[in-house]
C-alpha cells in the first residue's frame, strides 16, 4: 500500500491496532522490513508499508483526520471529499474526522445530502455500521451534538466557533464520499440548530447535546421541523431530567406557524403540543445551575408526523358541566406491540394539547379532538359517584344509572361506565332495579349480550364481587347492604343501541344487614341459573346473600343444586343455608360445611333461600351454583 | 335534517305478503336502532319491536312474533318491515320511527316516518 | 308488560285554557315516560321525554311532571293547533307501550 499525503493538506493519517481480540496469530504493519503496532502519516509524507497477515481488518483501524482552520484565512467551503480516495486505502475499518476550528461569530452548517441522519441514542448501533458522530465546542469544551445514522430526517445541523465531524465507514462498506458539505452562515448565537425534514408519515427521536449526560449550562438548542402543510405533528418527550436552577428556568419553547402566542413556553414535565400543521421550531433553555448541586438537564424526545385524519379537524364539545363527581379517560386500548411504524394516536384538549392519555373531569365544557388513523386504538373509561351524605334526603330517592349522550356522541368507544355508589354506614342500603330483568352470568349460562353490569362492593377492605348481569334473565332487583360499584361494560359496538332500552335505576332504601338480596321472578320458558357472589374466590367469611323466589301461581319451582356438597371447610362459626316457604314459613336448614346439598325441590310457592357462610379455612371455599325451573303445575294443590 | 322516508300505501289480499320500506338519511344509520309501530284504523299505538341496524338482530313485541320480520339493506340507509299471511287486523298504518342515544332513549321515538297505510280486504 | 292509562279518553277545553293530562303506569317506571301529539292523518311527534325534558323545537306552554306511577302533561295558554291526540309511552324496558290516548277537543 502506499498513501501520499500533499504538502499543506493539513492531514494526519494513523493506522492503528483496533480492539483486540482473541486472534491466536499477531499481524504487524511492514515498513522496509520493520514490523510495528501504529503508523502516522503527515502532510507532505509519502509512505510504503504492508501487513504481515491475510486479515488486517481483524487487527487494525485506520483513522484520517482533516483540520480545517477557519482562523486565519478563508474557509474551504462546499462539498467535502474524502482525502486519501477509499481507493487508495487499506480496507480497514476507517473513521475520517474534518475538525473545523473558527471563530465564535462565524456559523458552520453541515449540510447532508440523502440520505438524511437519524440520531442514535446511547448503546444503539447503525445497520450498516456507518456513523456519524458530530461534536462542538464551547470554549475550550468539547460538546458531543449526537451520534447519527443514515435513512432519517436529519439534513443540517448549525454550529458556531467548530465543529468536528467523525464519518466510520466499516472496511467492507464501498462508500467514496462524504456525504455532507460545509456552509458559513452568521452567527446561531446558541449552541446548535439541528433542522429535521419530513418528506411524509414518520417518527424521528432526538436528544440534548451529551445526552445522556447533562446538557451544557445556561445554553440553548434548537429543533428546526419541515414538516410538509398537510401532514400533522406531535411532540412526546421519552425522558427527561432537570438540574438544580440557581438562576432562570429549564424550559422548551416552541414557534409555530399560526400561533399568536409565539414563541409559546413549555416546562418539560408539561404535555407538550400535538397536532400542529407544518414547520415548526422547539428551543431547549438551560440555566443557571447551583454550584453545590449541579444536577443535570438532558432530553431525549419525539416527533410524530401524520396524515390528519377526518377525525382531526372536528371539534367535539364534551359537557360535563352539568355533571357532579365524574371524571371520564379515554386511553389506548391494550393491544400487542406491533415492530413496524404505527403512526400515533392521540386525543387532543382545544386541538393543541395531545396526548395518548386524556381525562376530563366534571363541571366544565370541553373541547377534545382526535389526532389518530384508527380510533378503534383508543377507548373510554368513566366513573361517577353518586353519594348521599344525609340519610333523611336520600332515602327512597332514585337516580337512572344512564350514560350521558355527549360520551356517546365521542367517535371512541366505550369501554367501562362506572357508577360508584355511596351510602352512609348502617344507615341505607341500595336497591337496584333494572328496566329489563337481567340474566346473572354463569359458564353454565354465559352472557352474550354487548354490554354487562359488573356488580362489586366499593368498600376498600371488602373483596366482594356480586357477579356480572346481562339484560334478558329473571332478575328483577338487586338490594345491596353499602357501598357497591355498578359498571356497564361493553363488549360491541352495537351495544349503545341495546343499552339504550336497558334502564337501570338504584334508589336508596332503609338499611339492612344482609350482604345482597337477590328478587328473582323466573319465566316459564327458561331455567334461571343463580350463583353466589365471588364466584372462585369464595363468598367472604361471616357474609350472607339471599335470593327471594317468585313462583306465580299456576306453576311448580324446580330448585336444584349442582354439587353434592359445597365444598366448605369452617375455621370458626357454621356455614349454612335456609330454604324458606314464603307463605307458611315453613323452613329447612342445611349445614353447608357438613351435610349434602339438598337433592332437587319442588315449590308451589314463592320462597328464599339464604346462604350464611362461616369463617372458611383457605383454599375451602364456599362456591354454590343452583338452579330454577318452572313447569306449569299438573294439580291445583291449593 | 333528520328524516324517515316510508314507501306508499298498500292494498292487499288475505295471505298475502306485504314489504313496507324506510328510509333514513340526515345521520348515520347504523347508530341508531329502528323501531316499528302499528296503529289500527281508530286506535291507539301498539310497538311492533325493533331491529339492531348495527348487528341486523331483530326484537319482537309478544304480539308481533311469527307472520312479521324487520331486515335492513344498510348500505342503502333502509329498513324493512314485511308482514306474511296478512289478515284482516293487519290493516292498520305502521310507522318506523327512530329513537336516541340518550340514557334510555332508544324507546323514546324522537323521528317518525310519515307512517304506510296497509289495507287488507278480499 | 306494563300498562299505561289514560283516565281522560277525551278533553274538551277552550282556546287559552291551561289543561293537564294524566297517565297512570301499573308500576313503577322511573320517570322513564314520554309524551306525543298525534293530530289527524299525521305521524305522531315527540313532546316531553324523560318525564320532564322538552323535546327540541316545543313551545315552553307544554311541560311535563310525575314520578313513580303518575305522571301527567300540562299545556298552558291552548292554541289551536294544540288540538289532537296525546299519547303517553313508558320506555322502561320492552316492550314500550302506549297509553290509550287523550283526545283533546275544541269547546
Known amino acids: 500500500f502506499e498513501i501520499a499525503l500533499p504538502r499543506e493538506s493539513n492531514i494526519t493519517v494513523l493506522i492503528k491496532l483496533g480492539t483486540p481480540t482473541l486472534l491466536a496469530k499477531p499481524c504487524y504493519i511492514v515498513i522496509s522490513k520493520r514490523h510495528i503496532t501504529m503508523l502516522s502519516i503527515k502532510s507532505g509524507e509519502r509512505i510504503v508499508f504492508t501487513f504481515s497477515c491475510q486479515s488486517p481488518e481483524n487487527h487494525f483501524v485506520i483513522e484520517i483526520q482533516k483540520n480545517i482552520d477557519c482562523m486565519s484565512g478563508p474557509c474551504p467551503f462546499g462539498e467535502v471529499q474524502l482525502q486519501p480516495s477509499t481507493s487508495l486505502l487499506p480496507t480497514l475499518n476507517r473513521t475520517f474526522i474534518w475538525d473545523v476550528k473558527a471563530h465564535k461569530s462565524i456559523g458552520l452548517e453541515l449540510q447532508f445530502s440523502i440520505p438524511r441522519l437519524r440520531q442514535i441514542g446511547p448503546g444503539e448501533s447503525c445497520p450498516d455500521g456507518v456513523t456519524h458522530s458530530i461534536s462542538g465546542r464551547i470554549d475550550a469544551t468539547v460538546v458531543r451534538i449526537g451520534t447519527f445514522c443514515s435513512n432519517g430526517t436529519v439534513s443540517r445541523i448549525k454550529m458556531q466557533e467548530g465543529v468536528k465531524m467523525a464519518l466510520h465507514l466499516p472496511w467492507f462498506h464501498p462508500r467514496n464520499v462524504s456525504g455532507f458539505s460545509i456552509a458559513n452562515r452568521s452567527s446561531i448565537k446558541r449552541l446548535c440548530i439541528i433542522e429535521s425534514v419530513f418528506e411524509g408519515e414518520g417518527s424521528a427521536t432526538l436528544m440534548s447535546a451529551n445526552y445522556p449526560e447533562g446538557f451544557p449550562e445556561d445554553e440553548l438548542m434548537t429543533w428546526q421541523f419541515v414538516v410538509p402543510a398537510h401532514l400533522r405533528a406531535s411532540v412526546s418527550f421519552l425522558n427527561f431530567n432537570l438540574s438544580n436552577c440557581e438562576r432562570k428556568e429549564e424550559r422548551v419553547e416552541y414557534y409555530i406557524p399560526g400561533s399568536t402566542t409565539n414563541p409559546e413556553v413549555f416546562k418539560l414535565e408539561d404535555k407538550q403540543p400535538g397536532n400542529m400543521a407544518g414547520n415548526f421550531n422547539l428551543s431547549l433553555q438551560g440555566c443557571d445551575q447551583d454550584a453545590q448541586s449541579p444536577g443535570i438537564l438532558r432530553l431525549q424526545f419525539q416527533v410524530l408526523v401524520q396524515h390528519p385524519q377526518n377525525e382531526s379537524n372536528k371539534i367535539y364539545v364534551v359537557d360535563l358541566s352539568n355533571e357532579r363527581a365524574m371524571s371520564l379517560t379515554i386511553e389506548p386500548r391494550p393491544v400487542k406491540q406491533s415492530r413496524k411504524f404505527v403512526p400515533g394516536c392521540f386525543v387532543c384538549l382545544e386541538s393543541r394539547t395531545c396526548s395518548s392519555n386524556l381525562t376530563l373531569t366534571s363541571g366544565s365544557k370541553h373541547k377534545i379532538s382526535f389526532l389518530c388513523d384508527d380510533l378503534t386504538r383508543l377507548w373510554m373509561n368513566v366513573e361517577k359517584t353518586i353519594s348521599c351524605t344525609d340519610h333523611r334526603y336520600c332515602q327512597r330517592k332514585s337516580y337512572s344509572l344512564q350514560v350521558p349522550s355527549d360520551i356517546l356522541h365521542l367517535p371512541v368507544e366505550l369501554h367501562d361506565f362506572s357508577w360508584k355508589l355511596l351510602v352512609p354506614k348502617d344507615r341505607l342500603s341500595l336497591v337496584l332495579v333494572p328496566a329489563q330483568k337481567l340474566q346473572q352470568h354463569t359458564h353454565e349460562k354465559p352472557c352474550n349480550t354487548s354490554f354487562s353490569y359488573l356488580v362489586a362492593s366499593a368498600i376498600p377492605s371488602q373483596d366482594l364481587y356480586f357477579g356480572s348481569f346481562c339484560p334478558g334473565g329473571s332478575i328483577k332487583q338487586i338490594q345491596v347492604k353499602q357501598n357497591i360499584s355498578v359498571t356497564l361494560r361493553t363488549f360491541a359496538p352495537s351495544f349503545q343501541q341495546e343499552a339504550s332500552r336497558q334502564g337501570l335505576t338504584v334508589s336508596f332504601i332503609p338499611y339492612f344487614k344482609e350482604e345482597g338480596v337477590f328478587t328473582v321472578t323466573p319465566d316459564t320458558k327458561s331455567k334461571v341459573y343463580l350463583r353466589t357472589p365471588n364466584w372462585d374466590r369464595g363468598l367472604p367469611s361471616l357474609t350472607s346473600v339471599s335470593w327471594n323466589i317468585s313462583v306465580p301461581r299456576d306453576q311448580v319451582a324446580c330448585l336444584t343444586f349442582f354439587k353434592e356438597r359445597s365444598g366448605v371447610v369452617c375455621q370458626t362459626g357454621r356455614a349454612f343455608m335456609i330454604i324458606q316457604e314464603q307463605r307458611t314459613r315453613a323452613e329447612e336448614i342445611f349445614s353447608l360445611d357438613e351435610d349434602v346439598l339438598p337433592k332437587p325441590s319442588f315449590h308451589h310457592h314463592s320462597f328464599w333461600v339464604n346462604i350464611s357462610n362461616c369463617s372458611p379455612t383457605s383454599g375451602k371455599q364456599l362456591d354454590l351454583l343452583f338452579s330454577v325451573t318452572l313447569t306449569p303445575r299438573t294439580v291445583d294443590l291449593t | 335534517e333528520v328524516t324517515l322516508k316510508e314507501s306508499g300505501p298498500e292494498l292487499k289480499k288475505p295471505g298475502e305478503t306485504v314489504k313496507i320500506s324506510c328510509k333514513a338519511s340526515g345521520y348515520a344509520f347504523t347508530k341508531y336502532g329502528m323501531n316499528w309501530v302499528k296503529q289500527a284504523p281508530g286506535k291507539d299505538l301498539k310497538f311492533m319491536g325493533w331491529?339492531?341496524?348495527?348487528?341486523?338482530?331483530?326484537t319482537y313485541a309478544d304480539d308481533f312474533k311469527g307472520r312479521f320480520d324487520f331486515s335492513l339493506e344498510a348500505s342503502a340507509s333502509t329498513a324493512f318491515l314485511r308482514i306474511n299471511n296478512l289478515k284482516n287486523e293487519d290493516t292498520a298504518t305502521y310507522f318506523c320511527?327512530?329513537?336516541?342515544?340518550?340514557?334510555?332513549?332508544?324507546?323514546?321515538?324522537?323521528?317518525w316516518g310519515q307512517g304506510t297505510t296497509v289495507t287488507v280486504s278480499s | 308488560d306494563i300498562v299505561m292509562t289514560q283516565a281522560a279518553a277525551s278533553l274538551s277545553v277552550t282556546v287559552g285554557e291551561t289543561v293537564t293530562i294524566t297517565c297512570r303506569a301499573s308500576e313503577n317506571i322511573y320517570n322513564n315516560l314520554a309524551w306525543y301529539q298525534q293530530q289527524q292523518g299525521k305521524s305522531p311527534q315527540l313532546l316531553v321525554y324523560?318525564?320532564?325534558n322538552l323535546a327540541d323545537g316545543v313551545p315552553s306552554r307544554f311541560s311535563g311532571s310525575g314520578s313513580g306511577t303518575h305522571y301527567s302533561l300540562k299545556i298552558n295558554s291552548l292554541q289551536s293547533e294544540d288540538f289532537g291526540f296525546y299519547y303517553c309511552q313508558h320506555f322502561w324496558g320492552t316492550p314500550p307501550t302506549f297509553g290509550g290516548g287523550t283526545k283533546l277537543e275544541i269547546k
Open positions: 324523560a318525564a320532564t
Open positions: 331491529i339492531n341496524t348495527y348487528t341486523g338482530e331483530a
Open positions: 320511527s327512530r329513537g336516541d342515544d340518550y340514557g334510555t332513549g332508544g324507546y323514546v321515538l324522537f323521528y
